[in-house]
Amino acid sequence: ECGHISVSAPIVHLGDPITASCIIKQNCSHLDPEPQILWRLGAELQPGGRQQRLSDGTQESIITLPHLNHTQAFLSCCLNWGNSLQILDQVELRAGYPPAIPHNLSCLMNLTTSSLICQWEPGPETHLPTSFTLKSFKSRGNCQTQGDSILDCVPKDGQSHCCIPRKHLLLYQNMGIWVQAENALGTSMSPQLCLDPMDVVKLEPPMLRTMDPSPEAAPPQAGCLQLCWEPWQPGLHINQKCELRHKPQRGEASWALVGPLPLEALQYELCGLLPATAYTLQIRCIRWPLPGHWSDWSPSLELRTTERAPTVRLDTWWRQRQLDPRTVQLFWKPVPLEEDSGRIQGYVVSWRPSGQAGAILPLCNTTELSCTFHLPSEAQEVALVAYNSAGTSRPTPVVFSESRGPALTRLHAMARDPHSLWVGWEPPNPWPQGYVIEWGLGPPSASNSNKTWRMEQNGRATGFLLKENIRPFQLYEIIVTPLYQDTMGPSQHVYAYSQEMAPSHAPELHLKHIGKTWAQLEWVPEPPELGKSPLTHYTIFWTNAQNQSFSAILNASSRGFVLHGLEPASLYHIHLMAASQAGATNSTVLTLMTLTPEGSELH
């Protein structure tokens, strides 16, 4: 061994200086008598070594590294040997920090494993091997006086928790507990906890179960859940308070908390929930009024709330078949009476014959919003209900009566925009209770079954905006019927477009006769098209060779026109414009030449 390094300290604070010396023995005869000692930190040569020959003939080089900024590195003492660097000795240097004070020390007592589990946060990285030890002692008082020491608890490498087994614990008696951190640069200790293991007990949660329905017990109300829990038996004698949390399975709702509940409640009716909704529920408990830790949340229980019977008003409307007045088509619309009005599974139309107490005759059961049935000859009234698994809505009576009320007047309609129509009227006297407004495609596409309808509950209304099922360029028939206490008034109807289309093309012009100064033209009118408003007029335009233009306006029933005052032997361009309220379209251009003065008239 030719060389030897000694260092001021092999482990230092990161960034601190370090001094090293390397001594080369004299008996390394194969060396240059005056060898130059070089220093290397890791792979980098370090300048600044001060070399001297000592009295015993050895060579010494001393170097001071002003800042050791590597957490780990090898410092080598070297000589040039031929063309290569010969390492004579090397030492491992480490730099880091003394341990920070461990913080957030907390413990919990697990009654199943019979151990006190303590955990802490070790603080920032020291870059050095650092050991943690959980230290504790038994104490009669508030840990001011130390009793028997408890065997140190050393966590597995890298872990920041440790378990003190039951044999080292005394329940209902205080223990002093702290964490000691130690490395080559120092020792630190956490603040001491003084605790009775029972005061940090963490219980197991109860098991949630659905309550078995008993025959004599009333079923839960709508929006309610009946549930029970099975306490964790080993914790049964510990007074606890519990809390439930619940949220709908669907959607993004956050948990809602219910509590405190006594552990002993064992069963509970949770209300104020959405009806017919699947919920996830969990429970947890804590020792109380004595100190403790909350248990984990229990495994989830999934339950569905019961429905509520539909709370809706059913607006109804009916019409009889022309050929068979006993065949009735009944229409209805559910109007929610509350924000959550209950799911509707279907509808039933029924009739109770007079004199037959209790006997109800169903006429139809449907999920649709209308049904057609044969009305028994003695029936003047039927009942309509909406239903679901929880029950039915309040029955809506539908009375079939003759039209005996006064009619409304001045029914008119006008377009608001391409997808809505305003229908207005003058209310009759006396005021009706309301109106039924029906609308659907007018002729030739008219169909009774495809009509949309709405109930206007305000008898003083003088109009209604139709926004459903209105498309541009379609002719609509709108029917309004006033409704009275036990009867209705006659229906009135009006036709309207929400938006009309300009004529798609104008009729083709044909020359019928021509002379020197006149020309007779004719055309065949286009047949009327659905969605296109009727023609209001035609305009005929003609232009001479000098680009002078002339025109004449003709009424919509015109089939021809004679141009007078033309120049003989002259060229003219003529076209016809067909116009409606929605716009106008031009025909193709007809070009003609009037006859020469000596020519004969053409017929």
């Epitope: 009654l111 199943t112 494993t113 019979s114 039951r166 044999k167 329940l171 029972m198 306490p231 038996q233 080993p234 049964l236 004698h237 510990i238 007074n239 006594p262 002993e264 409640a265 064992l266 009024p289």
Partner: antibody
């Protein structure tokens, strides 16, 4: 000092009824589970029933289920055991016990003798 | 139900002897095991709760150990006042159950 004092024992005919009481003092009665344990002459200990601090939970031994009812009056610091349809095998010394948080009988009364005989 | 089996059912020992009584549960009960001492004509007295915790006022010669299914009560040096019957009891699960008892007699 924690004390439990049973009363109400005595001789009763088979099929008869008896109500035992246990007066508690020296601790906050309403915070603790309480229980009844019996010991037939010359035999070991047998747990009979327990009751939670507020009275909501009342487990029973199978041998007395449906015949005995445990109850408590926290305002009077008193524990009760109503015994109906008594049988000869119910003959025993009945002890009232204060239960600790981990289910141990931390304090016991001196016991009251119930004899069921015709 | 959890069965508790105590052994021996009786033993004879002298003052100063070290005495060990065992109790076995038919299923795991963690540390939920309590030991009682009963003298003739008296109520039982709690010695050890939760397997190894000495009840206040109980002499330190009594100690308990074990967990799961096997438990031991040890009297390190038997005293004249220790001659009595000893019972173990589980409080892990209802119904609460006792062992059959171990009678410690003077040799």
């Amino acid at each position: 000092e924690v004390q439990l004092l049973e009363s109400g024992g005595g001789l009763v005919q088979p099929g008869g009824s008896l109500r035992l009481s246990c007066a508690a003092s020296g601790f906050t009665f309403s915070l603790y589970w309480m229980g009844w344990v019996r010991q037939a002459p010359g035999k070991g200990l047998e747990w009979v029933s327990s009751i939670s601090s507020s009275g909501g939970v009342t487990p029973y031994a199978d041998s007395v289920k449906g015949r005995f009812t445990i109850s408590r009056d926290n305002s009077k610091n008193t524990l009760y055991l109503q015994m109906n349809s008594l049988r000869a095998e119910d003959t025993a010394v009945y002890y009232c016990a204060k239960l600790g948080e981990l289910g141990s009988g931390s304090t016991w009364g001196q016991g009251t003798l119930v004899t069921v005989s015709s | 139900d959890i069965q508790m089996t105590q052994s021996p059912s009786s033993l004879s020992a002298s003052v100063g002897d070290r005495v060990t009584i065992t109790c076995r549960a038919s299923q795991g009960i963690s540390s939920y095991l309590n030991w009682y001492q009963q003298k003739p004509g008296k109520a039982p007295k709690l010695l050890i709760y939760y397997a190894s915790n000495l009840q206040n006022g109980v002499p330190s010669r009594f100690s308990g150990s074990g967990s799961g299914t096997d438990f031991t009560l040890t009297i390190s040096s038997l005293q004249p006042e220790d001659f009595a019957t000893y019972y173990c009891q589980q409080s892990w699960h209802y119904p609460l159950t006792f062992g059959g008892g171990t009678k410690v007699e003077i040799k």
